[in-house]
């Protein structure tokens, strides 16, 4: 999904924000969660040749050449029971083929504690390079949008948000992008109902706090085993 009704982010205000690209075009967002790992929505890569994906860090304006960027390929994929029918567990971790250089424009995001739930009315920030609206193109400059957490019409298996009083929300191309609440990544943009930014239903995010132990175990495993295990399949293999 892309952000509809938002505003331009300050350049590199969100240095953990990642663009996933195919043939030079943005198709989903992601979040840098370790120097060599990004987190996105599972549906973003479900039908994609992951070997062709480029993971772009340090970007702001996708239509410009930016010296701040660091570009990686995907070495390995970790999924956690993604259910495309019921849109559950819409989370994927992509291991990069190298480690990012951490600097002012590229930084690792902070995650909440395992199981931490957001209450109704919490103010958060959604972001992304998704569509700017119906019949409008994809954003060149990263957009951000203030949203409110809602618990009505939202499963426990999601974090949901709504913008009250106007038509705004996430849209195509924003999928996989982070939802930032109190400085922590609490959501991964997953799906919308009633069309982009309809304001008629909450936007749904994968609930990062429900997956923190799993995320930590993957990052920890890679630190313990920096080299791929001999039995591991070839690069960009999927691991559940």
């Amino acid at each position: 999904s892309e952000i509809v009704g938002g505003r331009r982010a300050r350049p590199h205000a969100w240095p953990f924000m990642v663009s996933l690209q195919l043939r030079g075009g943005h198709f989903c967002g992601a979040t840098l969660i370790a120097p060599n790992f990004v987190m996105s929505a599972a549906h973003c890569v479900a039908n994609v040749n992951v070997r062709a994906v480029r993971v772009v860090l340090g970007a702001h304006n996708l239509s410009r050449r930016e010296p701040t960027r660091q570009v990686f390929a995907v070495q390995r994929i970790f999924e956690n029971g993604y259910d495309p029918v019921n849109l559950l567990n819409d989370i994927v971790i992509l291991q990069l083929n190298g480690s990012a250089t951490i600097n002012a424009n590229v930084q690792v995001a902070q995650l909440p504690a395992q199981g931490r739930r957001l209450g109704n009315g919490v103010q958060c920030l959604a972001m992304g390079w998704g569509l700017l609206g119906r019949n409008r193109g994809i954003a060149s400059v990263l957009q951000e949008l203030n949203v409110t957490v809602v618990t009505s019409l939202c499963r426990r298996s999601n974090v949901c948000t709504l913008v009250r009083g106007r038509q705004a929300g996430v849209c195509f191309g924003d999928s996989g992008s982070p939802l930032v609440c109190n400085g922590l990544i609490h959501g991964i943009a997953s799906f919308v109902r009633g069309g982009c930014a309809s304001g008629l239903y909450p936007d749904a995010f994968a609930p990062v706090a429900q997956f923190v132990n799993w995320i930590d175990s993957i990052i920890q495993r890679s630190e313990d085993n920096p080299c791929p295990h001999p039995r591991d399949p070839d690069p960009a293999s999927r691991t559940h």
Epitope: S152, L200, Y201
Partner: nanobody, 119 residues
Framework: EVQLVESGGGVVQPGRSLRLSCAAS????????MHWVRQAPGKGLEWVAV????????YYADSVKGRFTISRDDSTNTLYLQMNNLRAEDTAVYYC????????????WGQGTLVTVSS
């Protein structure tokens, strides 16, 4: 079985007000956005207004903006349309309709209630 039953229509003079109701049953009313749509004699359907699942967001056709107000009461599963400053061009059969969240379509309609604005 989903049922939507409109009421409150009638004959009214220009400039007067009318309040339409729509009683909903057979589904979890509070989970859905709801719409009002109208059809003037010999004309096509015209979308009038929509209210979000929780009532926080409301949108209107330009032709009724500032005159009509959509509201809902989830405790009684009822949708309302308050119509003020009615005009002759508001004469139509008014339908309430249930939203289909995934499709940007309306999947269930009521039988309609006729509003005639005439002096």
């Amino acid at each position: 079985e989903v049922q939507l039953v409109e009421s409150g229509g009638g004959v009214v003079q220009p400039g007067r007000s009318l309040r339409l109701s729509c009683a909903a049953s057979g589904f979890t009313f509070s989970n859905y956005a709801m719409h009002w749509v109208r059809q003037a004699p010999g004309k096509g359907l015209e979308w009038v207004a929509v209210i979000s699942y929780d009532g926080s967001n409301k949108y209107y056709a330009d032709s009724v903006k500032g005159r009509f107000t959509i509201s809902r009461d989830d405790s009684t599963n009822t949708l309302y349309l308050q119509m003020n400053n009615l005009r002759a061009e508001d004469t139509a059969v008014y339908y309430c309709a249930k939203d289909l969240p995934w499709e940007w379509e309306l999947d269930y309609w009521g039988q309609g209630t006729l509003v005639t604005v005439s002096s």
